[in-house]
């Protein structure tokens, strides 16, 4: 049965759709695969630092070190890319910080996806001294193997030189790369020596082969593309937020929630409310009003704002958000001082969130 | 792995109530909705409405309000759907299926003949 | 409600050729289409979420693309095994519509 009595006639689903909007997204570490990464926990005066991977515990292993407020991860696979999140316990609180891994290199080759500084990589030689190809920028080969999240775009590198300007071409798993191997082809920047695949799909997985090569000869070098399947998962809040605000009777106050979701999310404020003098109807359940939640008519759901408050208007409000997966919800209180009494911010502890992964 | 179980064909006459049960293994019963889908070979598809186990929200299509109730039994991971005042437009194949649809019961089979 | 539109009940391929299934909502869904194959005698099976993210342990031959109102669901290289019916489905919203079925025949 719902954990909750509504009352104004609100209902948890509008029928009208939601509105779409930017949706916030945790602070990501990017590492490629081999390498080490440290992360640490961004949370204040923490006594005790605890750790969780994808909502599950995470424990000190042969590449897992936790000490104190950081983690390391050494020789980082595509295994170790999720959502991880510190929680930091206090005497009277406890707070979590949320943050993603992303074992990968989004934009392949180490370089801008602009190519800004490819120019100097198109090497010109005196017509005199007849070389062989030869790699300008090794650094930029260095990475062989990347895992890239689905829908993202890949680039290869091959900068070169030789004499006469080497020719360069490109092999998937060593057959001639055509453009109709791939649903929307690919880019050939011969300038820039590179290769682009833009919203890479799990087929694009393999190796990719670039030969340079002129009348003295060959190079080629191969790089090795994953693909990164994502499984659909409910909405995802930071933590912290909304947080704790007080402020003075007549006075504005925003409170914030900040929404993760490759899905749509439908974000909800429902503050507890009094009916007939009571918090609770005939159920024991308590009394939620829905004071604004994304639709049509609504404006920036993420953000519920209050003026000319009100003694009426302090209490816990709720943000609650869900898509076609499941659900979150966090929650804020808000202090009303009298007039007199100027208001300060309170510490900010937020109610615990509703991850039950 | 994920797994729903669903319960048994049944056999019943119109106006009557049927309650069938999706069991959960596998899985957090309460992090994900469950869902439930309406097939026919007349209408394709159809989504009845979704229940979310942790708190009991439920969300329905405005087509099976007052036709469909869903209810959760958290201790034994099991969702159910009871279908009230039934007619032979009932008759159909009904599924659970987890929060991303990316598990699905093997179906319930509702026929209702007098 | 969105309608999600199949405009093909029925489509004929061999075994090798390659085949897009398309789907139309009725009105902007962003990216929030998956797709489904259904076999005879079986419960629906998720191959598409978010209009182009592949499912796990789904092969690479099927893949998803589009957004907004249009939609495509590809079989780069059709298989025996892929007799089946195929059903995209909005998840923008609630109610979460699915398109009316094409059936695939393999010739």
């Known amino acids: 049965r719902p954990s909750f009595s509504l009352v104004e006639d609100t209902t948890l689903e509008p029928e009208e759709p939601p509105t779409k909007y930017q949706i916030s997204q945790p602070e990501v570490y990017v590492a490629a695969p081999g390498e080490s990464l440290e992360v640490r926990c961004l949370l204040k005066d923490a006594a005790v630092i605890s750790w969780t991977k994808d909502g599950v515990h995470l424990g000190p292993n042969n590449r897992t070190v936790l000490i104190g407020e950081y983690l390391q991860i050494k020789g980082a696979t595509p295994r170790d890319s999720g959502l991880y999140a510190c929680t930091a316990s206090r005497t009277v609180d406890s707070e979590t910080w949320y943050f993603m891994v992303n074992v990968t290199d989004a934009i392949s080759s180490g370089d801008d996806e602009d190519d800004t500084d490819g120019a100097e990589d198109f090497v010109s030689e005196n017509s005199n001294n007849k070389r062989a190809p030869y790699w300008t920028n090794t650094e930029k080969m260095e990475k062989r193997l990347h895992a890239v999240p689905a829908a993202n775009t890949v680039k290869f590198r091959c900068p070169a030189g030789g004499n006469p300007m080497p020719t360069m071409r490109w092999l998937k798993n060593g057959k001639e790369f055509k453009q109709e191997h791939r649903i929307g082809g690919y880019k050939v920047r011969n300038q820039h020596w590179s290769l682009i695949m833009e919203s890479v799909v799990p087929s694009d997985k393999g190796n990719y082969t670039c030969v340079v090569e002129n009348e003295y000869g060959s190079i080629n070098h191969t790089y090795h593309l994953d693909v990164v399947e994502r499984s659909p998962h409910r909405p995802i809040l930071q933590a912290g937020l909304p947080a704790n605000a007080s402020t003075v009777v007549g006075g504005d106050v925003e409170f914030v929630c900040k929404v993760y979701s490759d899905a749509q999310p439908h974000i909800q404020w429902i503050k507890h409310v009094e009916k007939n003098g009571s918090k609770y109807g005939p159920d024991g359940l308590p009394y939620l009003k829905v004071l604004k939640h994304s639709g049509i008519n609504s404006s920036n759901a993420e953000v519920l704002a209050l003026f000319n408050v009100t003694e009426a208007d302090a209490g816990e409000y709720i943000c609650k958000v869900s898509n076609y997966i499941g659900q979150a919800n966090q929650s804020a209180w808000l202090t009303v001082l009298p007039k007199q009494q100027a208001p300060g911010r309170e510490k900010e502890i937020t109610a615990s969130p509703d991850y039950l992964e | 792995q994920p797994y729903l179980q669903q319960s048994g064909a049944e056999l019943v006459r119109p106006g009557a109530s049927v309650k069938m049960s999706c069991k959960a293994s596998?899985?957090?019963?309460?992090?994900?909705?469950m869902h439930w889908v309406k097939q026919t070979p007349r209408q394709g598809l159809e989504w009845i409405g979704a229940?979310?186990?942790?708190?009991?929200?439920?969300s329905y299509n405005q087509k099976f309000k007052g036709k469909a109730t869903l209810t959760v039994d958290k201790s034994s991971s099991t969702a159910y759907m009871q279908l009230s005042s039934l007619t032979s437009e009932d008759s159909a194949v009904y599924f659970c299926?987890?929060?991303?649809?990316?598990?699905w019961g093997q179906g319930t089979t509702l026929t209702v003949s007098s | 409600d969105i309608v999600m539109t199949q405009s093909h009940k029925f489509m004929s391929t061999s075994v090798g050729d390659r085949v897009s299934i398309t789907c139309k909502a009725s009105?902007?869904?962003?990216?929030?289409v998956a797709w489904y194959q259904q076999k005879p005698g079986q419960s629906p099976k998720l191959l598409i979420f978010?209009?182009?993210y592949r499912y796990t342990g789904v092969p690479d031959r099927f893949a998803g693309s589009g957004s907004g109102t249009d939609f495509t669901f590809t079989i780069s290289s059709v298989q025996a095994e892929d007799l089946a019916v195929y059903y995209c489905?909005?998840?923008?919203?609630?109610?979460?519509?699915f398109g009316g079925g094409t059936k695939l025949d393999i010739k």
């Open positions: 299926a987890r929060g991303g649809f990316d598990y």
């Open positions: 596998g899985y957090t019963f309460t992090s994900y909705n």
């Open positions: 229940i979310f186990p942790e708190n009991g929200d439920t």
């Open positions: 009105q902007d869904v962003s990216t929030n």
């Open positions: 978010s209009a182009s």
């Open positions: 489905q909005q998840h923008y919203s609630s109610p979460y519509t």
